[in-house]
């Protein structure tokens, strides 16, 4: 697959995943009333990260927001935070990746800069996807725990014992938003990985190590920035280089390609 195609596909996949993460975060069906082996209620309850809803048999639906921060479970707050972090990172990732796309020309931005931006956006997408997957998984774990707790105690109170009145214990199971979140997180993660792979292809073999050769008296000495290591022209892993008096040129100008041992 060509680098452009890999980068473009990674971007599209991440974009779809990101849209899914936003959709999942906004959806009200994170948990839905379990209808199996339960008292059949004439109302259907479902809950999201931001509000809980009730659909009556007529189809009339009423939703109420969670207008408190302190009264909410810490786990719910954590899931909210993870999803928001995922969205924020996704937004940044999309903005960065738009500028990084090989098919889009922006000024005199070279492939090296685009590669770095592609890698950055890829990492952002990966983290965004991981945040969503963790958020959804934490919520799902919370649901499973509560489900079994309410199964063990289907009715709070002791029914006929001591004249106490039974209370209907509504059990909740996985809602559509969880599946949307898992898939979206996975897509964002895959898209991010594809962007990182594309970054490797975008990087010319020498683009990370631009050696500048200077004319040194009597000796062909190449000073390599970042390496701080001089090499005489006589080693087995150096080639003859054109050296110009009084000037310095990068090896890129001569289209020479260092071997993997050239730089330590």
């Amino acid at each position: 697959m060509s680098v452009t195609a890999c980068q473009g596909l990674g971007f599209v996949v991440s974009l779809i995943g990101f849209a899914g993460i936003i959709a999942a975060t906004c959806m009200d069906q994170w948990s839905t009333q379990d209808l199996y082996n339960n008292p059949v209620t004439a109302v259907f309850n479902y809950q999201g990260l931001w509000r809980s809803c009730v659909r009556e048999s007529s189809g009339f639906t009423e939703c109420r927001g969670y207008f408190t921060l302190l009264g909410l479970p810490a786990m719910l707050q954590a899931v909210r935070a993870l999803m928001i972090v995922g969205i924020v990172l996704g937004v940044i990732g999309i903005l960065v990746s738009i500028f990084a796309l090989k098919c889009i020309r922006i000024g005199s931005m070279d492939d090296s800069a685009k590669a770095k931006m592609t890698l950055t956006s890829g990492i952002l997408f990966i983290i965004s996807g991981i945040c969503a997957i963790i958020g959804v998984s934490v919520f799902a774990n919370m649901l499973v725990t509560n489900f079994w707790m309410s199964t063990a105690n289907m009715y709070s109170g002791m029914g006929g014992m001591g004249g106490m009145v039974q209370t209907v214990q509504t059990r909740y199971t996985f809602g559509a938003a969880l599946f949307v979140g898992w898939v979206a997180g996975g897509l964002t993660l895959i898209g991010g990985v594809m962007m990182c792979i594309a970054c490797r292809g975008l990087t010319p073999d020498d683009s990370n190590f631009k050696a500048v050769s200077y004319h040194a008296s009597g000796q062909n000495v190449a000073y390599r920035p970042g390496g701080f290591k001089a090499s005489t022209g006589f080693g087995s892993n150096t080639r003859n280089k054109k050296i110009y008096d009084g000037g310095a040129r990068t090896e890129d100008d001569e289209q020479s390609h260092p071997t993997k041992y050239d730089y330590v």
Partner: antibody, heavy 119, light 113 residues
Framework: EVQLVESGGGLVQPGGSLRLSCAVS????????MHWVRQAPGKGLEWVAY????????YYADSVKGRFTVSRDNAKNSLYLQMNSLRAEDTAVYYC????????????WGQGTLVTVSS | DIVMTQSPDSLAVSLGERVTMNCKSS????????????LTWYQQKPGQPPKLLIY???TRESGVPDRFSGSGSGTDFTLTISSVQAEDVAVYYC?????????FGQGTKLEIK
Amino acid sequence: EVQLVESGGGLVQPGGSLRLSCAVSGFTFSSFGMHWVRQAPGKGLEWVAYISSGTTNIYYADSVKGRFTVSRDNAKNSLYLQMNSLRAEDTAVYYCVRSGYYGNSLDYWGQGTLVTVSS
Amino acid sequence: DIVMTQSPDSLAVSLGERVTMNCKSSQSLFNSGNQRNYLTWYQQKPGQPPKLLIYWASTRESGVPDRFSGSGSGTDFTLTISSVQAEDVAVYYCQNVYIYPLTFGQGTKLEIK
């Protein structure tokens, strides 16, 4: 004006069958769930069955489960109650009732049709 | 099944008097999702089908006089007529509209002295 008109009641022998119909007008029938409620002579109200607007949800009282079948034809604006294996205790006035939009209430009632099960 | 118990079975009051009747359910009719109680009150006058008075335990149906009011939560509910009129002579039923089967109370008969 909302109108619910029941028909099909009458005298039937124990073990016999009867089919009640309810003709509806004055509202979009296909958008509302419908109930059957009965009232034995001189007694209180007893809920019998419910069918949702799209027939996806159907519920029955324990006393009629397995013997009565509720159905609807949205094209004909009609609700039905097929009653089989009738018993003396099924003798009652049967009301066709619309399920209200709010609070699962039963907001519009027909005048009822009398079913008498007797030998 | 939820058992609905109404009290008293009947009561006789003078015109203009305030009257309250009670309804008790064997299970809570409160839904925490929307903080509503799924209890409905009906009025049935002699020879007529029932008429919806109150839903969600306390919300008056449109067209119902404001002398009728409902209250209560969970398992204990009350229907109050602030000033009884002659046309209020009827049997009043409460109904569980929360869990199937939707059960009715046995009714409270209101008469004028």
